[in-house]
């Protein structure tokens, strides 16, 4: 039985040209996390964090995706096209797969504040 829950940074906004941290946290389960995959709104993979082997940033994103902090992901040099859904997929044993959702809005405004709060989707 899958008992875990994913907490995420929920809905966040950030300035065009700036950076943003995407964070997820898996709790309430003793399952072993084998891999965490970060995916973009069009379902393309941004990065994989393997428990033993570390990070693999996908070639198309190497210039502006940085691993961490922790199991999170930092998106840099944001463009308006980065607006959309992001997913963290936790692959665990023996539970299976947990998935969290974050919505990022990239704002043109120079006064846009980076707002983030942890919430359970």
């Amino acid at each position: 039985m899958m008992t875990g829950t994913i907490e995420t940074t929920g809905n966040i906004s950030a300035k065009k040209g700036g950076s943003v941290i995407l964070q997820c946290h898996l709790s309430s389960t003793m399952a072993q996390v084998t891999q965490v995959n970060w995916e973009q709104h069009d379902h393309s993979l941004l990065a994989i964090r393997n428990a033993e082997l570390g990070w693999h940033i996908y070639p198309a994103f190497k210039d502006r995706v940085a691993p961490g902090p922790g199991l999170g992901l930092t998106l840099q040099s944001l463009t308006m096209n980065d607006t959309g859904e992001y997913f963290c997929t936790y692959h665990t044993y023996p539970d299976g797969t947990y998935r969290g959702r974050i919505f990022l809005e990239v704002l043109e405004s120079s006064v846009a504040e980076h707002s983030a709060r942890f919430q359970i989707p």
């Epitope: 995959n37 393309s44 994989i48 570390g54 990070w55 693999h56």
Partner: antibody, heavy 120, light 107 residues
Framework: EVQLQESGPGLVKPSETLSLTCAVS????????WNWIRQPPGKKLEYIGY???????YYNPSLKSRVTISRDTSKNQFSLKLSSVTAADTAVYYC??????????????WGQGTTVTVSS | DIVMTQSPDSLAVSLGERATINCKAS??????VAWYQQKPGQSPKLMIY???YRYTGVPDRFSGSGSGTDFTLTISSLQAEDVAVYYC?????????FGGGTKVEIK
Amino acid sequence: EVQLQESGPGLVKPSETLSLTCAVSGYSITSDSWNWIRQPPGKKLEYIGYISYSGNTYYNPSLKSRVTISRDTSKNQFSLKLSSVTAADTAVYYCARLDFSNYGGAVDYWGQGTTVTVSS
Amino acid sequence: DIVMTQSPDSLAVSLGERATINCKASQNVRTAVAWYQQKPGQSPKLMIYSASYRYTGVPDRFSGSGSGTDFTLTISSLQAEDVAVYYCQQYYTTPWTFGGGTKVEIK
């Protein structure tokens, strides 16, 4: 260039333990991931598991109860032990390197493979 | 486990013609797919990673495409040295799994 060479007995009796070693040259096993993959005759390649640069291991859950992968950094080699073998473990066994940072789970260097037959 | 199913099992193509190999994943693996070439009597060689990126030294007649569940390896102009068995592999989730292989021969 990275080179990998498997060694070990080609014939193992049922219920015994299969033991193979992979000698690595041209690269240190304290970097990247070192893997065992097998191919039974007429079947798919099957991932057995790996030992990471730090010595942590991952085993395919289907084999986990029978598999041990270890390493000897002083000899720059790593080993596979598979216990309680049956005829279904007859296969070509490959050792391989995986550079996860650059290529994800794609295996970029393979040994030439060694055939292991389980038979009495 | 994710099952990778390749088609066709074998393929005969004339020299200089296009060869197309398909791989279908039992669930969405995004672009976490690699392709390997195994020539007779040799070990597999990495050709494509991340679904569409050629590995170092791989000729540009080889290309990979696809995302989600459907992937393709294309040899744009088959050469004699391309005769081999080709395998796909997913690494979206562990255990990483392989397809059954497609044998490419010359017609």
